[in-house]
Interface confidence: low
Amino acid sequence: EAHKSEIAHRYNDLGEQHFKGLVLIAFSQYLQKCSYDEHAKLVQEVTDFAKTCVADESAANCDKSLHTLFGDKLCAIPNLRENYGELADCCTKQEPERNECFLQHKDDNPSLPPFERPEAEAMCTSFKENPTTFMGHYLHEVARRHPYFYAPELLYYAEQYNEILTQCCAEADKESCLTPKLDGVKEKALVSSVRQRMKCSSMQKFGERAFKAWAVARLSQTFPNADFAEITKLATDLTKVNKECCHGDLLECADDRAELAKYMCENQATISSKLQTCCDKPLLKKAHCLSEVEHDTMPADLPAIAADFVEDQEVCKNYAEAKDVFLGTFLYEYSRRHPDYSVSLLLRLAKKYEATLEKCCAEANPPACYGTVLAEFQPLVEEPKNLVKTNCDLYEKLGEYGFQNAILVRYTQKAPQVSTPTLVEAARNLGRVGTKCCTLPEDQRLPCVEDYLSAILNRVCLLHEKTPVSEHVTKCCSGSLVERRPCFSALTVDETYVPKEFKAETFTFHSDICTLPEKEKQIKKQTALAELVKHKPKATAEQLKTVMDDFAQFLDTCCKAADKDTCFSTEGPNLVTRCKDALA
């Protein structure tokens, strides 16, 4: 229903706390360089204005769209051009072009320092002094580094953060209480960020139809007892929610997500038997819980898929007269039977089916032509299954750090032109798939591995799109989203690459490495490994292992030495010489 004042409507629906949080996230995601204080001031002004509209919907400017109101606020920021360059040109445009322009200037890799967690004592002090400001800082810092973070989920993570601080700041040993819990939230939030970015990429590059197909497959796996109409309704609503969040319409997105959660909880009987626990929770926890609810038990009496989609005489008629609905039902039926497949694989199978019908329905004897289509799925299914087996075996043998290194070598050989920091970040993230997925039961491994890898590779593509340097990466990133992971997996050593010349300074280290946290030490070593591969792309695994073992031994020795500086300055050059010899 139409509302006189959109801002009053959203304020009333969401309540002040969530309204303010979402406006803060929106501003932080659009203008990523502004300080918390600058954004907090704007948020307060917008909130005060919203309250005047709640009191009187006919008050001046209350009828304006949220894009107009928020855009006008952002464009009124002093020194916009000095701080943001051409983004300031957006302010010369009218809505909706202005908002589209802001969206296009979102930076997936902003040059901001890493978000450092303060000491436990300091954190607890500032949290106790002003919990609202403390949580505001958290929202701001995460949102500006992750400009497509799913806003209602970020509110959920802030709530988790709040609960952890409330609990741990009352403990004697705050540090040991906070660290593992906050690490857990951070890890989940980072995964949530790359997953959501993938959804926005799907939406931006291939439109709502592609996202809706993703949603149909995912929802059909989770709710195999829901009928097609129900799944379609949920997919349509979920698509709307994601479109709004990806488009920067965060108030609408959060409001519609709450509506969708309410609908699901009111219609459990026709959706799933597994929703009750989620539905008993408060709003943010409820929506989060529903988004990762376990799969319902599959109906026992599902007929063979061939009955509807291969043996039926009306296959071509259905395809010709109701293509999207027919392909949608195929995707639904196949997905509900295969919770053990990744969504990417299910979409590849649907694409294969569509291509087969496109070809066969134009032939003289269509059934003879498409009769073997399900058998033709086999290689498409085997490929990711083999990928999971091979990689999980390797992970179990090497552990997370060793597995990351194996991936780093592999990906540096595939795309040596890509910057070392990007390769290291990608390999570390790809390597975490082992810890995340390889310990799961067999039937959960494939969906976990492939859908996670796809999300990480999407980030690789986004970073590469800014400065394209590798034809291999361009090729894989230009195709459809579901083909990316197989495309990257199939890449081999880039034969066109001219190896980097050996620079001793790249492999020169100083005693300051000894005091770095373990993660930073690993990154330094992995940076060196990538540089080695760029120098010798065809080095054998054995050669690289020899060099890295020598390197690890060198660090261990010098970091234990009484005079670390002398050790590094004398043993370092020897290490470099040995490295060169080992790779010669």
């Epitope: 072009e97 589209e100 931006q204 590059k205 439109g207 139809r209 799109e465 394209p468 361009t474 230009s478």
Partner: nanobody, 126 residues
Framework: EVQLLESGGGLVQPGGSLRLSCAAS????????VAWFRQAPGKEREFVAG????????YYADSVKGRFTISRDNSKNTLYLQMNSLRPEDTAVYYC???????????????????WGQGTLVTVSS
């Protein structure tokens, strides 16, 4: 699969006008952003203009801003490039290109466009 077919090129005097058309076919073409690129002899392909698919947004290279206008008629699946105040340096083969299903022009790098027309030659000379 997307198919693109340009027409409307020819010889025109400096200061003159031309309207190029790009007939686009393929599934969901109206939801796909389409771009015009050009390639002068001995030079690389360069982005000229683009228009969103299902999104009211247009893009122009600085060199053509204010002189060229891009539009589309989804009912005819046709993209247009109206070129006014033509200059000799506008001489090139003009191509339309598409990245299927992408509603916005998010990159102006020619390599990222998998679908191209065969091109139409525009010569600006007195």
């Amino acid at each position: 699969e997307v198919q693109l077919l340009e027409s409307g090129g020819g010889l025109v005097q400096p200061g003159g006008s031309l309207r190029l058309s790009c007939a686009a076919s393929g599934r969901y073409i109206d939801e796909t952003a389409v771009a015009w690129f050009r390639q002068a002899p001995g030079k690389e392909r360069e982005f000229v203009a683009g228009i969103g698919g299902g999104v009211d947004i247009t893009y122009y290279a600085d060199s053509v801003k204010g002189r060229f206008t891009i539009s589309r008629d989804n009912s005819k699946n046709t993209l247009y490039l109206q070129m006014n105040s033509l200059r000799p340096e506008d001489t090139a083969v003009y191509y339309c290109a598409a990245r299927p299903g992408q509603p916005l022009i998010t990159s102006k790098v020619a390599d990222l466009y998998p679908y191209w027309g065969q091109g139409t030659l525009v010569t600006v000379s007195s």
